[in-house]
């Protein structure tokens, strides 16, 4: 008895496709190794038709794949277009040859079902509606005219010219003649379900002078359309429902035993376990629309389905989509914290994923926003400017190359909790859904600016110091000035080491910045932060103003523009070998050319990109001097 | 409310035929793998066969190879009833046959959503 399984007999017809799903046990070999499928002939060979491995037979070309479903100990072999060439013995099978672990399958495609030659064949999908054309001699103009569905005896009458209508197509069933032809009668059937499929005869007159016409309604549920989706990925669903929906609500919902259950409508409504990584998009005015989900999880593997009704809701005999989505827990994005926590006045480091292979690809931050139909304004991106309401307190820091980019966003409130959709213009798969937790700080913050009330005088020398804890020695500490374009690091070089010391003073670890001489262009937006290498951890902020020599010094800072940071992140690492540094930067950057604001993230990455050249974040033209001091005592 | 009400069983002699029925009202047939199940008295619940529809010309008919060669699984979807033909039958076939609706999900036999009384099949020799 063969460990594999699957449907030992497929029985279909021309033109349609099949899904073969065969089980294997649930072993690590059996996971990695080869899977097929073959066709045996009548010498007992079996000859690979596909296999895992990346073959596809010339016979099969463009119209059959084979996936495995390593988390679920099966592999599925799609083939479409069936002819009855197709029909014969297969094996689908596991190893390195066609004589390992197989099943046998046998698939018959037989031709569409022959019907009297006077028969009018029409096919139509669900939710559909049809009109059905019934022409008859003019002697039987006056006559009563017909439509009825045969049954295993009878014709059971639907609808006729006096207004008899059969129970189950009220509202639904229309007898009418078009201007003055009086040789043709037509039956519009409209909400067509499964029941509705079958043999009709259409009639004028009665006797064996009366017209017949025989009729062959199929009623198609439509075929799913396989999605094979990485674990934390994005999946986009694409419906198009027609023009005659176009005003009706619409709706995303997910197969359940006997119902299907609503993840998202146009009305509103949205399943909570999707809060946060889903958008609906209306396209146009046809009737189209797109469901985005993010951050793709196990359990979202199923049957999907779309729709349009007026109560959001599915409904029987309305059109429908529909969708298998796999869920691949091999993925190639990389398991990233899905929620990250801080405090209020402290700061967050979000790494963002993206694909490698996309360094060069716009990257954006934008937070998800639940009412109406779900929508993700962006926020700070590689080419798009910070909001305003974010001014001084987010930035995106690209790391080309290392398949992260880090955005930071610091004097955090409460406010700023919620989720937040990390995306590129690249690869779309690749959006990812992070959940901002923000708890009320209890403790004193890590990183600390003095002074606090920053006023620079115009001309003259002004410092400000960051004070760190001991926890923070082994990291790398910066100043950057933020602008809306980023928050450009203060260039720095190391002056001089000081020898090893094993004792750490936690009130006097600082580094300092030294505008030497103050310009306005110096006004603006500090921060100080620690970073390891490409890895951001906590900054603070703070607003330095700039004031002629001849005005006082006293300024109003911004609203919570000097706010205490608070731990974010938590590091654990004290580094006990030190260095005296004295580095002297110089900041330099280039000019940026205007760039369009991102205003929204639909469901098209492309619609994403923003013109303008890429260059150094924002700063000053002019050659000024900026000390960073390390003070260890 | 969904309802699988089996019908066709009774008592046959070996190497006998019975065609046993399964009326599904109230369940959106089309959309569930339909399979029938068997119980002898102080065995476990046994796979038979199942058959998956795909809504247009296509049926996957899978059977237990205790029964393969022996029995034909059917459906018509326009009546929301299955079929299992049993030919060729022996008395180890003798156990109360259970009518199941599934989900069509990939780990289908992991467990069916809707299951009839049963119908008892009686073989004797």
């Known amino acids: 008895k063969s460990p594999i399984f699957g449907p030992q007999e497929v029985s279909s017809i021309e033109g349609d496709s099949v899904s073969i799903t065969c089980y294997y046990p649930d072993t690590s070999v059996n996971r990695h190794t080869r899977k097929y499928w073959c066709r045996q002939g009548a010498s007992g060979m079996c000859t690979t038709l596909i296999s895992s491995n990346g073959y596809l037979s010339k016979e099969y070309s463009g119209r059959a794949n084979l996936i495995n479903f390593p988390e679920n100990n099966t592999f599925v072999i799609n083939i479409e277009q069936l002819t009855q060439d197709d029909t014969g013995s297969y094996k689908c099978g596991l190893g390195t040859s066609n004589r390992g672990l197989s099943f046998d399958v046998s698939l018959e495609v037989s031709q569409v079902p022959e019907l009297p030659s006077d028969t009018h064949v029409y096919t139509k999908d669900i939710g559909r509606n049809v009109t059905i054309e019934c022409p008859f001699k003019r002697e039987n103009a006056p006559s009563k005219k017909s439509l009825c569905k045969k049954t295993n005896q009878s014709c059971e009458l639907v609808i006729d010219s006096t207004e008899k209508v059969n129970p189950s197509y009220i509202g639904r069933a229309k007898l009418f003649m078009k201007g003055t032809d009086l040789t043709v009668f037509y039956v519009n059937i409209s909400h067509l379900t499964h029941n509705d499929a079958g043999l009709y005869i259409c009639q004028a007159g009665e006797g064996p002078s009366a017209d017949k016409k025989n009729v062959d309604l199929q009623v198609l549920a439509p075929e799913p359309e396989l999605l094979y989706k990485d674990l934390r990925s994005s999946v986009t669903f694409e419906c198009d429902l027609g023009r005659e929906v176009a005003n009706e609500a619409k709706y995303l919902c997910r197969m359940n035993k006997e119902t299907c259950d609503v993840i998202i409508n146009t009305l509103g409504k949205r399943d909570p376990d999707f809060e946060g990584r889903i958008l609906i998009t209306p396209k146009d005015d046809n009737g189209r629309f797109s469901v985005l989900i993010t951050g793709l999880r196990k359990e979202d593997a199923g049957h999907y389905q779309c729709g349009a009704h007026s109560s959001g809701l599915p409904q029987e005999g309305w059109p429908i989509q529909t969708w298998q989505l796999f869920v691949n827990e091999e993925s190639t994005i990389p398991n990233r914290r899905s929620v990250v926590k801080g405090v209020t006045g402290g700061s967050v480091a979000i790494a963002c994923p993206y694909n490698p292979k996309e360094s060069s690809s716009l990257k954006y931050w934008c937070r998800w926003e639940g009412d109406g139909n779900g929508h993700c304004p962006v926020l700070v991106g590689t080419q798009a400017q910070v909001q305003e309401e974010y001014e001084g307190r987010l930035a995106l820091f690209d790391q080309p190359g290392n398949g992260t980019y880090t955005v930071i966003l610091n004097q955090l409130t409460t406010e700023d909790a919620g989720f937040y959709w990390c995306l590129t213009n690249g690869d779309s798969r690749w959006r990812t859904t992070i959940e901002l937790q923000v708890a009320e700080a209890t403790r004193e913050p890590n990183l600390e600016v003095t002074p606090q009330n920053a006023t620079a005088v115009l001309g003259e020398t002004f410092t400000v110091s960051c004070h760190y804890p001991c926890k923070f020695y082994s990291q790398e500490k910066y100043w950057c000035k933020w602008s809306n374009k980023g928050c450009h690091i203060l260039p720095s070089h190391d002056e001089g080491a000081r020898q090893s010391s094993v004792s750490c003073d936690q009130s006097s670890q600082l580094v300092s910045m030294t505008l030497n001489p103050v310009s306005k262009e110096d006004e603006g937006w500090y921060w100080c932060g620690v970073k390891q290498g490409q890895t951001y951890g906590e900054t603070t902020a703070i607003y330095i103003a700039v004031e002629e020599r001849t005005r006082g010094s006293s300024h109003v800072n911004p609203t919570d523009a000097n706010a205490r940071a608070k731990v974010a992140l938590e590091e654990e690492v004290v580094d006990s070998s030190i260095s005296e540094k004295e580095n002297k930067a110089i900041p330099n950057p280039g000019p940026f050319a205007n760039e369009r604001e991102i205003q929204n993230v639909g469901d098209q990455a492309q619609e994403n990109r923003a013109s303008g050249d890429a260059g150094s974040a924002d700063g000053q033209s002019r050659s000024s001097s900026s000390k960073h001091h390390h003070h260890h005592h | 409310q969904v309802q699988l009400v089996e019908s066709g069983g009774g008592l046959v002699q070996a190497g006998g035929s019975l065609k046993l029925a399964c009326a599904a009202p109230g369940l959106t047939f089309s959309s569930y793998r339909m399979g029938w199940f068997r119980q002898a008295p102080g065995q476990e619940r046994e796979f038979v066969a199942a058959?998956?529809?795909?809504?247009?010309?296509?049926?996957?008919?899978y059977y237990a190879d205790s029964v393969k060669g022996r029995s034909t699984i059917s459906r018509d979807n326009a009546k929301n009833t299955m079929y299992l033909q049993m030919n060729s039958l022996k008395p180890e076939d003798t156990a109360v046959y259970y009518c199941?609706?599934?989900?069509?999900?990939?780990?289908?036999?992991?467990?069916?959503?809707?299951w009839g009384q049963g119908t008892q099949v009686t073989v004797s020799s």
């Open positions: 058959i998956d529809w795909n809504g247009r010309g296509t049926y996957y008919r």
């Open positions: 199941a609706a599934g989900s069509i999900d990939l780990n289908w036999y992991g467990g069916m959503d809707y």
